[in-house]
Every structure is written in structure tokens, then in C-alpha cells.
């Protein structure tokens, strides 16, 4: 088992909104849970966009999930990752 590296980034979207993206890379096996939470509660599927789980060329895998949130509400959101029985929570950078 190889645990993922998780990286959260933000980019400007429309006025008053930002897109936050959570990327997991370098993990094995490929099964992973990656999702955005608001106040600890998973966002509905229709408000998140997921990338495919793809091989990254090193025998490990990568994927991502993104969502759009209101600027100023970043503190309420975290990316939740679960892989091979381990989990972690990742905040949106300031």
C-alpha cells in the first residue's frame, strides 16, 4: 500500500466564487474516496466534479475532485480522503 499525497488548490471562478480542487496522487491500490465536505458534511454529488482515477506512470494512481464555493466561506470546506483504511482532512489554503 502506498498512501496518497493530497494537495488542495484554489482558483478564481466567477465573481464572488472560487473553484477549489483537491488532488490525490502517488497512491496504490487505486481504490480511494475523495470528496468535498461543508461543515463536515459531504457535498451532494451534483455539486462536485470528479476526475478519473488514472495511472501516473510509476505504478501508482492519481485523481481529483473540485467544487465551486463562495469566496469568504473557505473555512467551512475541507477535502476528505480515505484510502486503505486511513483517512485525512485537508483545508482550503488561505
Amino acid at each position: 500500500t502506498v498512501p496518497p499525497m493530497v494537495n488542495v488548490t484554489r482558483s478564481e471562478a466567477s465573481e464572488g466564487n472560487i473553484t477549489v480542487t483537491c488532488r490525490a496522487s502517488g497512491f496504490y491500490p487505486w481504490n480511494i474516496t475523495l470528496s468535498w465536505r461543508q461543515d463536515g458534511v459531504s457535498l451532494s454529488h451534483d455539486t462536485q466534479q470528479w476526475g478519473d482515477v488514472l495511472p501516473d506512470g510509476n505504478g501508482t494512481y492519481q485523481t481529483w475532485v473540485a467544487t465551486r464555493i463562495c469566496q469568504g466561506e473557505e473555512q467551512r470546506f475541507t477535502c476528505y480522503m480515505e484510502h486503505s483504511g486511513n483517512h485525512s482532512t485537508h483545508p482550503v489554503p488561505s
Partner: antibody, heavy 118, light 108 residues
Framework: EIQLVQSGAEVKKPGASVKVSCKPS????????IYWVRQAPGQGLEWIGY????????IYNQQFKDRATLTVDKSTSTAYLELSSLRSEDTAVYYC???????????WGQGTLVTVSS | EIVLTQSPATLSLSPGERATLSCSAS???????LHWYQQKPGQAPRLLIY???NLASGIPARFSGSGSGTDFTLTISSLEPEDFAVYYC?????????FGQGTKVEIK
Amino acid sequence: EIQLVQSGAEVKKPGASVKVSCKPSGYAFTSNNIYWVRQAPGQGLEWIGYIDPYIGRIIYNQQFKDRATLTVDKSTSTAYLELSSLRSEDTAVYYCSRSGERSNFDYWGQGTLVTVSS
Amino acid sequence: EIVLTQSPATLSLSPGERATLSCSASSSISSNYLHWYQQKPGQAPRLLIYRTSNLASGIPARFSGSGSGTDFTLTISSLEPEDFAVYYCQQGGSLPLTFGQGTKVEIK
């Protein structure tokens, strides 16, 4: 089975502080937020705040920001609510709850009655 | 702050009757963020319905939820003796998280 077990009832004098504990079991402690809610006698439910045990992030209801302190002890998988400068209006049952996959409060502790009286 | 107003405050009904409880929000709420809880005397609340219309685990099918925007409804199709309790709506869309003041369903 998921359970949240809270500490016992407390009687405090006005101006004192109280610390209530909440020990969840049946799931990974750091995977879900712990919320705190209170209910005055015969009244409704009032959200105090929550803490993310994994990263330690705390969000307070502004109404409680100056007097409530939320903490966790990851070594014992226990969450705490401390409320300072108690007054009679703080007499209430204090509940801890766990954030769920789809809602804010999916499992609840049994409640801790805090009575503030001179 | 989003204020949730529940009506009626008290509902007096007999077992077997249909109960309709309303929850009105002061601002529009996404249906993903409106939840219902049941509380019996001396007990903690328990999750009944999440995201407006989804039954929580172990909740019987006589309970249902609906609504959108600012108006939401909890319906109990045929009251059982164990359904007499206080019901709260709660919104998780904006901070602070808020609850309605509750509707007490009592035996007539």
C-alpha cells in the same frame, strides 16, 4: 455501533466554568466533526459550534465565541466543551453530536445537564 | 442568520391520523441543507429525514419530507403511538446553523 457518551450532570455557580466531555466510539474519531448543541429547559435547540478533530479547526456560533472553547484529545478520542462566565440562562442540556455523510447531526450523545444556580 | 419558523407549534391528533408539519425559512435554502429531527421527552434528538426528503437509517416509511426554497414539509402518513414527540427542522446551508423552534405532536 456508533455511540457518543457524555460526562455527568454538573451544578455550577454564576461566574464559574464548566467542562463537558464527549467520547465517541464505533467509528474513527478524526473522520467526522464533533458538534455541540444546547437545549434550555422546555426550549428548542441551539448550535454552539463544531470542531474538526483531524485538523483542529473550530467554527463557533458567534453568539458563543467569547465564552465557549472546543477542544479534542486525540490520544483518548475525546471532545470537550468548556463554557466560562456561567449565568443562569446557561442552564441547559448540552449535547455533542457527530457530523454525518449527509446531515450535520447524525448521532447524538445522551446529553449533559448543566445547572447554574447561586 | 436564517430563521426557521415551524407551524403549528402544537398539533393534536389521534393515532392513525395524518400529520403535516411545516418549516418556513427566512431565506431560500438548497434542499440539500434541510433536515428533520425527532425528540422524545428525556431523550436526545435523532435524525429523521436528511436533505429534505431522504429517510435516515431505521426510520419507517410513514415519514416523508418535501419542499424547496423557503417552504418545507414533514408528513407522517398514519400516526403510531411512538410518533408523538417534538419535531425540529434544521438548516445547514449557512452559518450559524439553526433549528426551528419545534412542533409538538400530541395525542388528542
